[in-house]
C-alpha cells in the first residue's frame, strides 16, 4: 500500500535569465527512494538522480541544469520557453512510483520572485 505523499514547490515564478530550484519531497512513507526522474511538460527527461549511480543530465540542458540541492534540480539562465509543467517521479522500494508536479512561470519582469511553499536545507 502506498502511504507516501509528494510535496512540491507548487506554482513558482522566476525572472528571465535567473535561476530556480525545482524541489520535491516524499513524506509519510518509510520506502527507500532508489531514483528520482525529472521531466518537462512534454515528458522529455531533464535529469535522473539515482541513489547509487548519481546524476544523469540530459545533454541539451547540461549547461543550464545543475544537480541538487539534494534530489532537486537547479534550472539556470531561464528563458520564456522554460515556462510550463515539471514532474518529479520518485521510484521507491517497496512502494513503487510517486509523482509530483511543479508549474514554473518565467516572467520578463525584473521584480519576479521565486517563492516556495517549503524549503529543504
Amino acid at each position: 500500500m502506498m502511504t507516501g505523499t509528494i510535496e512540491t514547490t507548487g506554482n513558482i515564478s522566476a525572472k528571465k535569465g535567473g535561476s530556480v530550484i525545482l524541489q520535491c519531497h516524499l513524506s509519510s512513507t518509510m520506502a527507500q527512494v532508489t531514483q528520482v526522474n525529472w521531466e518537462q511538460h512534454d515528458h522529455s527527461l531533464l535529469a535522473i538522480r539515482n541513489a547509487e549511480l548519481g546524476w544523469h543530465i540530459y545533454p541539451a540542458f547540461k549547461d543550464r541544469v545543475a544537480p541538487g540541492p539534494g534530489l532537486g534540480l537547479t534550472l539556470q539562465s531561464l528563458t520564456m520557453n522554460d515556462t510550463g509543467e515539471y514532474f518529479c517521479t520518485y521510484h521507491t522500494y517497496p512502494d513503487g512510483t510517486y509523482r509530483g508536479r511543479i508549474f514554473l512561470e518565467v516572467l520578463e519582469s525584473s521584480v519576479a520572485e521565486h517563492s516556495a511553499r517549503f524549503q529543504i536545507p
Epitope: 521531466e39 515528458h43 522529455s44 527527461l45 547509487e52 549511480l53 544523469h56 543530465i57 541539451a60
Partner: antibody, heavy 119, light 107 residues
Framework: EVQLVQSGAEVKKPGSSVKVSCKAS????????IHWVRQAPGQGLEWMGG????????IYNQIFRGRVTITADKSTSTAYMELSSLRSEDTAVYYC????????????WGQGTTVTVSS | DIQMTQSPSSLSASVGDRVTITCRAS??????VVWYQQKPGKAPKLLIY???YRFTGVPSRFSGSGSGTDFTLTISSLQPEDFATYYC?????????FGGGTKVEIK
C-alpha cells in the same frame, strides 16, 4: 587515454565463484561509475550492476538474486565483479564499462573476460 | 522491468544503403536511450546517446531519434566497417535493459 583492462579467461566448476578484475587508467577513477555487463555465447547484452567509486554505492540487477558482488580498490583504480553459485548458463563474456560523467551511457569498455562454467 | 524490443533482428544490406533499426520500449522511457555497436569478438562501442547525440568520433552518417517508447537508429550510407550488431539500451529505470540486437550483414 582511457583504458579498462580486464583479467584473463577463467574456467570454473558449477557451484564455485569467479572474481573478475578491471583496472582503469587514463582518468580519475572516483569520478566515473563502473558497470558490469555480460554476454552469453551468441546472445545479447545483460546489465549486471554498477559501482560508484566516489561513495562506494552499488546497484545490482535483481535477476542475479544476491549472487553478484561489485567492489573496487580505489588505491589501484581497480573494480571487481564476483559471481557466486556458478551454473552452466553463467558461461559468458563479462565486460566492465565506464559511465560518462553526468551521463548514464557507457562510453569506454574493457576487452571482456571469458568465463566458462563446466564440470 | 522495461523490455526493449529491436527490429529487425537481422538485415542484409549493401554498401551505400540507408539502414534503419527500430527499438520499442515496453513503457515510457522518455529520451533515456543509448545505442551501441558491437563487432564479433569485440566489446561494444558507444554510438549514440540521449537518443540523438553522437559520441566522440562517431561518423555523421549515424543518427538517432525518438522519444517515449519508439526509437530509431539510422545509418545514412552504409560503409564496410558498419557491418556489425547494434543494441539499444534504456536507462530510464533500473535494471538497465538492452534490446536483443540487430545484426547488419553484407548482402
Amino acid at each position: 587515454e582511457v583504458q579498462l583492462v580486464q583479467s584473463g579467461a577463467e574456467v570454473k566448476k558449477p557451484g564455485s565463484s569467479v572474481k573478475v578484475s578491471c583496472k582503469a587508467s587514463g582518468y580519475t577513477f572516483t569520478e566515473h561509475v563502473i558497470h558490469w555487463v555480460r554476454q552469453a555465447p551468441g546472445q545479447g547484452l545483460e546489465w549486471m550492476g554498477g559501482f560508484n567509486p566516489n561513495h562506494g554505492g552499488t546497484i545490482y540487477n535483481q535477476i542475479f538474486r544476491g549472487r553478484v558482488t561489485i567492489t573496487a580498490d580505489k588505491s589501484t583504480s581497480t573494480a571487481y565483479m564476483e559471481l557466486s553459485s556458478l551454473r552452466s548458463e553463467d558461461t559468458a563474456v563479462y565486460y566492465c564499462a565506464r559511465a560518462a560523467k553526468l551521463l548514464f551511457a557507457m562510453d569506454y569498455w574493457g576487452q571482456g573476460t571469458t568465463v566458462t562454467v563446466s564440470s | 522491468d522495461i523490455q526493449m524490443t529491436q527490429s529487425p533482428s537481422s538485415l542484409s544490406a549493401s554498401v551505400g544503403d540507408r539502414v534503419t533499426i527500430t527499438c520499442r520500449a515496453s513503457q515510457h522511457v522518455s529520451n533515456a536511450v543509448v545505442w551501441y555497436q558491437q563487432k564479433p569478438g569485440k566489446a561494444p562501442k558507444l554510438l549514440i546517446y540521449s537518443p540523438s547525440y553522437r559520441f566522440t568520433g562517431v561518423p555523421s552518417r549515424f543518427s538517432g531519434s525518438g522519444s517515449g517508447t519508439d526509437f530509431t537508429l539510422t545509418i545514412s550510407s552504409l560503409q564496410p566497417e558498419d557491418f556489425a550488431t547494434y543494441y539499444c539500451q534504456q536507462h530510464y529505470s533500473t535494471p538497465w535493459t538492452f534490446g536483443g540486437g540487430t545484426k547488419v550483414e553484407i548482402k
